[in-house]
Every structure is written in structure tokens, then in C-alpha cells.
Interface confidence: medium
């Protein structure tokens, strides 16, 4: 299974549901289907209120039963560990794959945690995080923000994914905007130096 790198904002915007939840145990194979399901305990819903309607929560996360079909394999044995899960809604059920944005909540930077709760939503449907695969990259539209973490950091985990969101600057322009939470190392040019 091959997954394209995803900026957290893209994961948020492209998902039907974004929740915080704990995994309660091993997966259960669903007979006669190619799916298995993990029992989860949802602690907070961050996106999907409209899609879910009056449902009170999700007890299961469904995923393909085989890794070759991009099935998600949950490796942590810690049932008290909280995860951020960005998934799709199918037939009223939460579906995830190996490519889903699914990470321990505490692994997210404070800026990302804040953004998942309230900031990323402001860019959905308006702004696009545009991955840069070779320098120089070209912005195809003023509603795009160039995402350069992969080429400069060799990973999708970099300054832009950790500390920036692509948000509307005005009705015709989206730009990277600093999420304003202190960082462990100084960010080049993100603040004035006295």
C-alpha cells in the first residue's frame, strides 16, 4: 500500500470525520467481508457533526482486513492512549485505511492540536495545500499554498505541517499563516528579532 504524504490540514479537510478516540482492543474480523473492525471509544468529535446528525458516537472503526488492501494495523497496546483519527463515513460507519491520518494525539504539535480543534476548518473548501515535489514549484492558483516539507525535510513532518495552516488572506488569496504556538526550535523569519 502506497500513501501520498498528507499535510494535516488536507487530512482534516478531506475527511468526513475527525475524532479523538481510544482503541479498546484487537480487531474483530467481520465474516463474509474483507473488513475488520476495531472497537474504539470516542472522546471528542472535531469534524463531522453535520454528517453524523444526531448519532452520539462511534463504537467501531472499520478497515480492510488485509494490509495489501491498505488495511490499518493498530500497533499500540495502550488502551488509555488517545488518537486523532481522520476517516471517511460510509453507510453510517467510520472507515479508516493505512493511509488515513491517524496519530497519537500527544504526538501532534500544540499548534496542530489547536488547528484540528478550530483553525484548519477555516481553510476547507477555500484553500488548497499544494505539495511541492521539485524546486522550483509553481503555484497553480492563488488559492494554493506551496507545501515544501517533503523536499526540504525528506519527510511530511516539517515546519509547515507542524506550525502553519493554509488560510484565506482575502477572498482571492490563500497564504501560509503561522499558528502562533511556541515551538521547540526557532522558526526562520516567523517572528521579528530584536
Amino acid at each position: 500500500c502506497s500513501c501520498a504524504p498528507t499535510h494535516p490540514q488536507t487530512a482534516f479537510c478531506n475527511s468526513d470525520l475527525v475524532i479523538r478516540a481510544k482503541f479498546m482492543g484487537s480487531p474483530e474480523i467481520i465474516e463474509t467481508t474483507l473488513y475488520q473492525r476495531y472497537e474504539i471509544k470516542m472522546t471528542k468529535m472535531l469534524k463531522g457533526f453535520d454528517a453524523v446528525g444526531n448519532a452520539t458516537g462511534f463504537r467501531f472503526a472499520y478497515t480492510p482486513a488485509m494490509e495489501s488492501l491498505c488495511g490499518y494495523v493498530h500497533k499500540s497496546q495502550n488502551r488509555s492512549e488517545e488518537f486523532l483519527i481522520a476517516g471517511r463515513l460510509r453507510n453510517g460507519n467510520l472507515h479508516i485505511t493505512a493511509c488515513s491520518f491517524l496519530v497519537p494525539w500527544h504526538n501532534l504539535s500544540p499548534a496542530q492540536q489547536k488547528a484540528f480543534v478550530k483553525t484548519y476548518s477555516a481553510g476547507c473548501g477555500v484553500c488548497t495545500v499544494f505539495p511541492c515535489s521539485a524546486i522550483p514549484c509553481k503555484l497553480e492558483s492563488d488559492s494554493h499554498c506551496l507545501w515544501t516539507d517533503q523536499i526540504l525535510m525528506g519527510s511530511e513532518k516539517g515546519y509547515q505541517s507542524d506550525h502553519f495552516a493554509c488560510l484565506p488572506r482575502n477572498p482571492d488569496l490563500c497564504t501560509w499563516q503561522y499558528l502562533g504556538v511556541s515551538m521547540t526550535r526557532s522558526l526562520p523569519l516567523a517572528k521579528a528579532e530584536a
Epitope: I135, K138, L152, G154, Y178, L187, P188
Partner: antibody, heavy 119, light 108 residues
Framework: QVQLVQSGAEVKKPGSSVKVSCKAS????????ISWVRQAPGQGLEWMGG????????NYAQKFQGRVTITADESTSTAYMELSSLRSEDTAVYYC????????????WGQGTLVTVSS | DIVLTQSPATLSLSPGERATLSCRAS???????LAWYQQKPGQAPRLLIY???SRATGVPARFSGSGSGTDFTLTISSLEPEDFAVYYC?????????FGQGTKVEIK
């Protein structure tokens, strides 16, 4: 195609100031960092400082702190570098260069502006 | 400040030969933050390599970069006439974002 077009050559007296402009076209000005790099005759490259237009705040190399001011005007997609208290050793070609936020990797450069400081 | 020391200062080679340029940092630099530029007389620098080893768009395959930590190398596998120029390494790991003093590759 991205272009950075700088203002023309300047001759200045010691103690005076110079302000060089850098007008960007062909790209989204606000989505990048603009840095200034200088090169004295026959010498290497020296980063002076830079600005991210959407933040409006700049940072500077310690060497130039207090003498250089970098600003940006989003409405005209133009960045400016002003250097004060000029001395003869400030004679150099001054380049503006575009970098990806929040990185200082310069993929496009202006043509350079020669500033000569002479009495 | 991170000091980048390039060697040799001048490299005299003939077209078709291999050029190996060195850049040594005074302290460790993440390879993600190391770039190489080419500058010809009267022109602005041109980005060649970023992330220590990735070629910028339009840069011929004869240019390659390698290294990590404090030692980085730019290699030109077979010099073409247009490759004779000055080459600079740059770090953008920490402010101020410093350049090496340059290596001039000249025709022998």
C-alpha cells in the same frame, strides 16, 4: 515565470542611506520569504536578512542589526532593503532572493543592484 | 554563527574531467538545510542542489550532492564548458543563513 526586478545602481556618500527595491511578478508574493544577500567585489555571498510579507516582520543577521531595515508592500508585490550609516566596505552588489516559507532556500534571484559608497 | 569552509579555493580542470568540491561546517547541519549554488561572472547565483542531494528543476544529472553532519560534497561528473563558474554552499539550518566563501572551477 517568476521574476524579481531590482532598482538601479546607486552611488552614495559615507554616512548616508540607500534603499533598494525588489519587485516580484509571476508568483504569489505573500506566500514566500524575501531575503537580501550582498556580494562585495570579488567576494562571496552574505545573507543580510529577510521578511515574510504576510507576517510583515523581518529578521536580520546580527552583523547588520540596527543598520538594515527590510520591509514589504503586498499591494505592489515589492520588497525593500534600506541600509544606513553607509561606509566604503558596504560597496557591493545587493541581491533580493525568494525563498519558500519558512525556509531560506533561494530558487529565484533578482538581477542585483550595485551600491557604491564613495566620498 | 555556522561557518562554512569550502575547499579548494580554486579547482583547475579540463572539460570532461570530474570535479569534487567540499563544504565543511563548523557545527552539524541537517542535510535538509544544505544547498549549493552556481554563479557565473556578472550573474546572480543559481540554485543547483537542495537538501544536500536533491537537484533543483532543470539542473543536469551530472551535478550531484552528498554528505551529512559537517561534511558535504558537490560533484560534477564530467565538466561541460558552461560549468566553469564559482560554486557556493549555503546552510539555512540556523540564522544567520551563511554561505561558504566559494570554490572557483576554472579551465586548465
Amino acid at each position: 515565470q517568476v521574476q524579481l526586478v531590482q532598482s538601479g545602481a546607486e552611488v552614495k556618500k559615507p554616512g548616508s542611506s540607500v534603499k533598494v527595491s525588489c519587485k516580484a511578478s509571476g508568483g504569489t508574493f505573500s506566500s514566500y520569504a524575501i531575503s537580501w544577500v550582498r556580494q562585495a567585489p570579488g567576494q562571496g555571498l552574505e545573507w543580510m536578512g529577510g521578511i515574510i510579507p504576510i507576517f510583515g516582520t523581518a529578521n536580520y543577521a546580527q552583523k547588520f542589526q540596527g543598520r538594515v531595515t527590510i520591509t514589504a508592500d503586498e499591494s505592489t508585490s515589492t520588497a525593500y532593503m534600506e541600509l544606513s550609516s553607509l561606509r566604503s566596505e558596504d560597496t557591493a552588489v545587493y541581491y533580493c532572493a525568494r525563498g519558500y516559507i519558512p525556509y531560506h532556500l533561494f530558487d529565484y534571484w533578482g538581477q542585483g543592484t550595485l551600491v557604491t559608497v564613495s566620498s | 554563527d555556522i561557518v562554512l569552509t569550502q575547499s579548494p579555493a580554486t579547482l583547475s580542470l579540463s572539460p570532461g574531467e570530474r570535479a569534487t568540491l567540499s563544504c565543511r561546517a563548523s557545527q552539524s547541519v541537517s542535510s535538509s538545510y544544505l544547498a549549493w549554488y552556481q554563479q557565473k561572472p556578472g550573474q546572480a547565483p543559481r540554485l543547483l542542489i537542495y537538501g544536500a542531494s536533491s537537484r533543483a528543476t532543470g539542473v543536469p544529472a551530472r551535478f550531484s550532492g552528498s554528505g551529512s553532519g559537517t561534511d558535504f560534497t558537490l560533484t560534477i561528473s564530467s565538466l561541460e564548458p558552461e560549468d566553469f563558474a564559482v560554486y557556493y554552499c549555503q546552510q539555512f539550518n540556523d540564522s544567520p543563513y551563511t554561505f561558504g566563501q566559494g570554490t572557483k572551477v576554472e579551465i586548465k
